[in-house]
Interface confidence: low
């Protein structure tokens, strides 16, 4: 289980039409459910139940987004429509280039993601928890445009890789 270095860039537009970028670095782990690869894309926050909807036409995003899913406590969803791995697969089928799970409320999900599938996803499936998860969700909940960049080595410079 390797460290995933995640950079998140938040875009704040000003009245003049310019925008300011704020870069935050955090770390997670690549799970065995997916590939250990770099990925980049606009963040799309997905509710775990939103991934239950099988009607893809209602929920299509441009190919190449990074899905962020905050998992609920298992008690709040005793009969989930999909396993955590199933949720990751559903996101990838809808065009996600990577999926990041906040497992703070559901640490059991880590074992589920690391059980090792015979057919792992070809895209990264990363999990974050604790302070890193808080940082990520603080940005995601701002409802602003944000991009995530996932790497399997520390970035050299904060903005080196971002494709604006």
């Amino acid at each position: 289980k390797e460290t995933a270095f995640v950079e998140v860039v938040l875009f704040e537009s000003s009245p003049s039409g310019d925008y300011t970028t704020y870069t935050t670095g955090l770390t997670g782990r690549f799970s065995r459910a997916g590939a250990t690869l770099s990925a980049e894309g606009e963040i799309v926050q997905m509710h775990p139940l939103g991934l239950c909807n099988n009607n893809d036409e209602e929920d299509l995003y441009e190919y190449g987004w990074v899905g962020v899913v905050k998992l609920e406590q298992p008690e709040l969803d005793p009969k989930p429509c999909l396993t955590v791995l199933g949720k990751a697969k559903r996101a990838v089928q809808r065009g996600a280039t990577a999926v990041i799970f906040d497992v703070s409320e559901n640490p059991e999900a880590i074992d589920q993601l690391n059980q090792g599938s015979e057919d792992p996803l070809k895209r990264p499936v990363v999990y974050v928890k604790g302070a890193d998860a808080i940082k990520l969700m603080n940005i995601v909940n701002k409802q602003k445009v944000a991009r995530a960049r996932i790497q399997h080595r520390p970035p050299r410079q904060p903005t080196e890789y971002f494709d604006m």
Partner: antibody, heavy 116, light 108 residues
């Protein structure tokens, strides 16, 4: 500068194999899928498969399964595509391409001619 | 399997607008990317996603989507835009790329 440099042109006889190399520079080789795409003379682009340079995992287009093998040597940041049991219709330019959500960087192409 | 269909050829006068379509039944067209290829050269990405231009690609290139058809539009077409254009889409089930048959753009 990010670039992919491919090996030179090859002439092969039917039934032989060819191995094309693609050397990456200017970025972390293991960070992105590498794809192989070919183009027969006067024809369109045809996707052959990809390799994850970090793990070595591969996925081949159904048409080429059993004949194509994609490998990599991370120590020299090079991807390889080997096509076996060559036939005349395999005459084409073979490209490697890095995928960063889309295929953004392409090699210059390697012409493989299959002729008896 | 996904199939992407393009017109084999499109002609346009210099300064006019050229439109090249790419249609596919089983794929959301918003996943389509566009490549330009000139004779003897490797393909070059000109539009990705909805209508994003990589750096170095002129503003006259744009992309749009409607239903299952993606369209590449070149406004104020110039002689140097004469080339073959390919749409490409990621096949989520086959886990690979599919290309359209290509469109030869002729600038009269």
């Amino acid at each position: 500068q990010v670039q992919l440099v491919q090996s030179g042109a090859e002439v092969k006889k039917p039934g032989a194999s060819v191995k094309v190399s693609c050397k990456a520079s200017g970025y972390t080789f293991t960070s992105y899928h590498m794809h192989w795409v070919r183009q027969a003379p006067g024809q369109g682009l045809e996707w052959m498969g990809w390799i994850n340079p970090y793990t070595g995992d591969t996925n081949y287009a159904q048409k080429f399964q059993g004949r194509v093998t994609m490998t990599r040597d991370t120590s020299i940041s090079t991807a390889y595509m080997e096509l076996s049991r060559l036939r005349s219709e395999d005459t084409a330019v073979y490209y490697c391409a890095r995928e960063k959500v889309y295929m953004d960087i392409w090699g210059q192409g390697t012409l493989v001619t299959v002729s008896s | 399997d996904i199939e992407l269909t393009q017109p084999p050829s499109v002609s346009v006068s210099p300064g006019q607008t050229a439109s090249i379509t790419c249609s596919g039944d089983s794929i959301p067209s918003k996943y389509a990317h566009w490549y330009q290829q000139k004779p003897g050269q490797a393909p070059v990405l000109v539009i990705y996603g909805k209508s994003h231009r990589p750096s170095g690609i002129p503003e006259r290139f744009s992309g749009s989507n409607s239903g299952n058809t993606a369209t590449l539009t070149i406004s104020g077409t110039q002689a140097e835009d004469e080339a073959d254009y390919y749409c490409a889409a990621w096949d989520l089930l086959g886990d690979g790329w599919v290309f359209g048959g290509g469109t030869k753009l002729t600038v009269l």
